[in-house]
């Protein structure tokens, strides 16, 4: 950080490495929860028109797909991978692609993915071939 840019104590809006380098924040789709028509497809686009700068540079992009008897929703947000989201750890946060993994939630079908490339939660991937054989 240049000397004219103040350092701040205990502020997680500025992530630095051991050399004091500053991390650029992630750009993610961020529409919170929206109704979705994404169903029985290998991949879907979020149809979220808002790309937001994540508040904290350590945050990654997250997408949550939920289906119950009444509707399907898709949630797109930024989130810190050190913290659980919907009670689940973001285990794939370093992935460049948002590859959906099913999670156990009573009364609904629940898939979640996280990723760390710009707007990566715009394209959510359900296809098994990505989960197993795709190195990306």
């Amino acid at each position: 950080i240049p000397p004219h840019v103040q350092k701040s104590v205990n502020n997680d809006m500025m992530v630095t490495d051991n050399n004091g380098a500053v991390k650029f924040p992630q750009l993610c789709k961020f529409c919170d929860v929206r109704f979705s028509t994404c169903d029985n497809q290998k991949s879907c686009l979020s149809n979220c028109s808002i790309t937001s700068i994540c508040e904290k540079p350590q945050e990654v992009c997250v997408a949550v797909w939920r289906k119950n008897d009444e509707n399907i929703t898709l949630e797109t947000v930024c989130h810190d991978p050190k913290l659980p989201y919907h009670d689940f750890i973001l285990e794939d946060a370093a992935s460049p692609k948002c590859i959906m993994k099913e999670k156990k939630k009573p009364g609904e079908t629940f898939f979640m993915c996280s990723c760390s490339s710009d707007e990566c939660n715009d394209n959510i991937i359900f296809s098994e071939e990505y989960n197993t054989s795709n190195p990306d």
Partner: nanobody
Framework: EVQLLESGGGLVQPGGSLRLSCAAS???????RMWWVRQAPGKGLEWVS?????????YYARSVFGRFTISRDNSKNTLYLQMNSLRAEDTAVYYC?????????????????WGQGTLVTVSS
């Protein structure tokens, strides 16, 4: 020598407007995503807005969405931030910064990434 020179800051009343400029030189402006970053007294950096080098896709922090507008004039190597409906919490030093495609980190103490900043004070 790379230079980023911000201007346009000042004292403004809540609800007022300001337009910040950042004059860039010493590098190929059209190769960089450009950012506005701010730092309130005693606080960390807040990434306010960004704009792509070509095509002018823009991005905003949720705290400024709908109030601030980022733009660039590649023919003048200049970045702008139009700030409307200003609030006390927008008080900060505003810096422009540059980002190469794919770049994740900015090196420490590198003046070629940062300007000197311009102070915006929102107060009645």
């Amino acid at each position: 020598e790379v230079q980023l020179l911000e201007s346009g800051g000042g004292l403004v009343q809540p609800g007022g407007s300001l337009r910040l400029s950042c004059a860039a030189s010493g590098f190929t402006f059209t190769e960089y995503r450009m950012w506005w970053v701010r730092q309130a007294p005693g606080k960390g950096l807040e990434w306010v807005s960004a704009i792509e080098p070509i095509g002018n896709r823009t991005y905003y922090a949720r705290s400024v969405f709908g109030r601030f507008t980022i733009s660039r004039d590649n023919s003048k190597n200049t970045l702008y931030l139009q700030m409307n409906s200003l609030r006390a919490e927008d008080t900060a030093v505003y810096y422009c910064a540059k980002q190469m495609p794919g770049q994740k980190w900015m090196a420490k103490s590198r003046f070629d990434y940062w300007g000197q900043g311009t102070l915006v004070t929102v107060s009645s």
